[in-house]
Interface confidence: medium
């Protein structure tokens, strides 16, 4: 242990306020309270501390919560926040989202930072579930949160959560993450009525198998090519030429310029030419007249 | 059971470019392979960088941002470093690393499996 200096006479630290800002570094430590530094933590994010001084605080911080800090504490601590390492965020047992919120504060518009993710984890963790205030809450400061989690946790994200979800939380999922989400999502939304069910559905539909898209077919919904092209091949592939064109409505013509893109390329090759030619689009590669069409799967799904 | 394969390491002069892979087998469905550690001869393990399922969340440690990238892709189920303007100091084995985990994190504890590592040895 180090030999600790004195306080010099009349610096003693009756309260955390902009005197201490000129202080030394030793003055510091030997003259601050850290018991009066965990009650008046709200203060220092008010003072322009230098950062050696808030490598001081910490330490004194560190020394009074050795098992890690209090959350009365950690609601408080403002930029010494970003002077906490993962290991010492390890030991914090953070329940309130309020605590949470405080300090994803500090770190906005920055990229994630290893603290950040590590408190997001610890506190995640410790609720068991992304319930839809967290949720609302990771996705406000970084909407690429939700498609960072792998399809076995999205598992455990409960369906009234979906209604926290934006499209633009969507935009990095991949198939196997929406195959989670969806009928997470159809379950969220069931209650709504047509329209309003598809601007809510839509950006979840890279999950939908081939019954939900018939239904929408059924249902004027106008699907714009975008939402098509991020639809999963083997759920488009048994639609027909007539369920494509009410699914798309008027968009049914942006068909001609993804026609070399999947799905919409491997499911030209699943129609008739003739069918195709209905559309009017110069669509080509489907099934030539006269040509019988064998689904093997079928086949092997009845021997 | 999950097994972590590093490869990509070597012998590189500073300012070169090294990247680095991670093939992960076994129950990868629960752990995936999502950070990497690193171990210079006489230090702690320190945290490199980490990333979350989908790809898009990362967190760097201070030292490597802006110079390495880490990137995964889960059809192979393999994570990525690639590491650019390499300085003598980045000298160490750099480990794999797979967990459950809720997105990135920085925490070696959250980490149930370790690879062997592969040794990056930067040097004139």
């Known amino acids: 242990e180090v030999e600790k200096t004195a306080c010099p006479s009349g610096k003693k630290a009756r309260e955390i306020d902009e005197s201490l800002i000129f202080y030394k570094k030793w003055e510091l430590e030997a003259c601050v309270d850290a018991a009066l530094l965990a009650t008046q933590m709200d203060r220092v994010n008010a003072i322009p501390f230098t950062y050696e001084q808030l490598d001081v605080l910490k330490h004194k911080l560190d020394e009074l919560y050795p098992q890690g800090y209090p959350e009365s504490v950690i609601q408080h601590l403002g930029y010494l926040f970003l002077k906490m390492s993962p290991e010492d965020i390890r030991k914090w047992n953070v329940t309130s989202l309020e605590t949470l919120k405080a300090l994803l504060e500090v770190n906005k518009g920055h990229e994630m930072s290893p603290q950040v993710a590590t408190l997001i984890d610890r506190f995640v963790k410790g609720r068991g579930q992304l319930d839809k205030d967290t949720l609302d809450t990771l996705t406000a400061f970084y909407p690429g949160y939700l498609c960072s989690l792998s399809p076995e946790e999205l598992s455990s994200v409960p369906p009234s959560s979906i209604w926290a979800v934006r499209p633009q939380d969507l935009d990095t999922c991949d198939p196997r993450q929406l195959d989670v989400l969806y009928p997470k999502a159809r379950l969220a939304f069931q209650n709504m009525n047509g329209s309003e069910y598809f601007v809510k559905i839509q950006s979840f539909l890279g999950g939908a198998p081939t019954e939900d898209l018939k239904a929408l077919s059924q249902q004027n919904v106008s699907m714009d090519l975008a939402t098509f092209m991020k639809l999963r091949t083997d759920a488009v592939l048994p639609l027909t030429v007539a369920e494509v064109q009410k699914l798309l409505g008027p968009h049914v013509e942006g068909l001609k310029a993804e026609e070399r893109h999947r799905p919409v390329r491997d499911w030209i090759l699943r129609q008739r030419q003739d069918d195709l030619d209905t559309l009017g689009l110069g669509l080509q590669g489907g099934i030539p007249n006269g040509y019988l069409v064998l689904d093997l799967s079928m086949q092997e799904a009845l021997s | 059971e999950v097994q972590l394969l590093e490869s990509g390491g070597g012998l590189v002069q500073p300012g070169g470019s090294l990247r680095l892979s991670c093939a992960a087998s076994?129950?990868?469905?629960?752990?995936?392979?999502k950070a990497w550690f690193r171990q210079a001869p006489g230090k702690e393990r320190e945290f490199v960088a980490s990333?979350?399922?989908?790809?898009?969340?990362?967190a760097y440690a201070d030292s490597v941002k802006g110079r390495f990238t880490i990137s995964r892709d889960n059809s192979k189920n393999t994570l990525y470093l690639q590491m650019n303007s390499l300085r003598a100091e980045d000298t160490a084995v750099y480990y794999c690393?797979?967990?459950?985990?809720?997105?990135?994190?920085?925490?070696?504890?959250?980490?149930?499996?370790w690879g062997q590592g592969t040794l990056v040895t930067v040097s004139s």
């Open positions: 990333i979350g399922w989908g790809g898009r969340m990362t």
């Open positions: 076994g129950h990868t469905d629960s752990y995936y392979p």
């Open positions: 690393a797979a967990g459950i985990g809720w997105a990135p994190t920085a925490d070696s504890g959250e980490y149930d499996y």
